[in-house]
């Protein structure tokens, strides 16, 4: 039960995280105009990874795409790449994890296969989350650098009476969405990896604390109280030492090769 819950929760958390990463990548508010120096502006600027927008106080918003690849800063390109890699990995991870879910049966898929798929998806989610966090952090660092540079240059060229106030940008909503989403994907990935350990057949834990072997050689495995009798035919020996309490994780509809240890 705990393994299924952990796996299911990991999947849901990762799903929310990846949806958040996609949302953050598409959002226009990666950087927003800093109004501290000009709180009375009737024009509000904000920028995303793909376009920049201007919202007039009159209610009109105009967005223009960055219709150039070569003319864009390398850092912006790097952030785009990180976010896209994060989305792609996350999407593949989601696809893999759907088939890995314990509550979903696909033919006679073995537990080891599900365990491997859970681990794979978990790693993918972790990398996806890290990509998103890295992308957002790189962009945030770029903003901080530009912010202080523009602050230093804010009143340059003040020829007499004329003031030219340079537009400064600060953190936009997308950065926070990206950080949270990346974190959720990362947590989801960790949960999937933890669930994988519980799914692996050699790590199945039984609730019983004593085992009396009746003949044959008995090998105790440190991961729990599962005994290997050395025979390949005694299916009746499987799961009779659970203290009578069965959990959903321990109920198998179909026998796999791991039922015959």
């Amino acid at each position: 039960m705990a393994v299924t819950a952990c796996q299911g929760l990991g999947f849901v958390v990762s799903l929310i995280g990846i949806a958040g990463i996609i949302a953050a990548t598409c959002m226009d508010q990666w950087s927003t105009q800093d109004l501290y120096n000009n709180p009375v502006t009737a024009v509000f600027n904000y920028q995303g990874l793909w376009r920049s927008c201007v919202r007039e106080s009159s209610g009109f918003t105009e967005c223009r795409g960055y219709f150039t690849l070569l003319g864009l800063p390398a850092m912006l390109q790097a952030v785009r790449a990180l976010m896209i890699v994060g989305i792609v990995l996350g999407a593949i991870g989601l696809l893999v994890s759907i088939f890995a879910l314990k509550c979903i049966r696909i033919g006679s898929m073995e537990d080891s296969a599900k365990a491997n798929m859970t681990l794979t998806s978990g790693i993918m989610f972790i990398v996806s989350g890290l990509c998103a966090i890295a992308g957002v952090s790189v962009f945030a660092n770029m903003l901080v650098t530009n912010f202080w540079m523009s602050t230093a240059n804010m009143y340059t060229g003040m020829g007499g009476m004329v003031q030219t106030v340079q537009t400064r940008y600060t953190f936009g909503a997308a950065l926070f969405v990206g950080w949270v989403a990346g974190g959720l994907t990362l947590i989801g990935g960790v949960m999937m990896c933890i669930a994988c350990r519980g799914l692996a057949p050699e790590e199945t834990n039984y609730k019983a604390v004593s085992y009396h072997a009746s003949g044959h050689s008995v090998a105790y495995k440190p991961g729990g109280f599962k005994a290997s009798t050395g025979f390949g035919s005694n299916t009746k020996n499987k799961k009779i030492y659970d203290g009578g309490a069965r959990t959903e994780d321990e109920v198998q509809s179909y026998p796999s090769k791991h039922d015959y240890v």
Epitope: T41, A42, C53, G59, R64
Partner: antibody, heavy 118, light 113 residues
Amino acid sequence: QIQLVQSGPELKRPGETVRISCKASGFTFTTAGMHWVQKMAGKGLKWLGWTNTHSGEPKYAEDFKGRFAFSLDTSGSDAYLQIGNLKYEDAATYFCAKWGRGNALDYWGQGTSVTVSS
Amino acid sequence: DIVMTQSPSSLTVTAGEKVTMTCKSSQSLLNSGNQKNYLTWYQQKPGQPPKLLIYWASTRESGVPDRFTGSGSGTDFTLTINTVQAEDLAVYYCQNTYSYPLTFGGGTKLELR
């Protein structure tokens, strides 16, 4: 077509209160900010402020804070300018205007003349 | 506050002439986000409300004759009327639409000789 129709001329005594209305039609009232502009005889235009017709929040120019108040009746697409404790120097023509692209005032009311006389 | 200064305050012209009036702002009205200047020109005839002529310093409002041209950037702006006609006699105002308060210039009165 877009129209802003203002109430008729007002003759008031100093210290009294005047309320000017501006009825909008031909556009979605709650999507366009409503501005108020003062034109004194022989003088230029002065921006009083505006009301966000979506939120109802008014914004006043520094010179017009206190006695001047903007209000709305969104159900009837009406904007109001109320001037309390009238002074002689408030005698002017007041225009309401709709905000448009480029933050420009693209449609104007015909103006309401306020005369302050004892 | 941004101070808008218009010059000249009045202008006497002959019909058919080309007229140029200027508007200076104490701060730049250029918005870096879209590279547009938030300066607007209005025409006000006696007994009438102002009429929008030009926004974004150079974009003509629909229905405005093409003899009206707006130009300039940053702090210096110009309204040009090619071949002035009798119906162009009015007061012309520029307005800062970049930051609050949305200040107007003092106006330029156009009169016929």
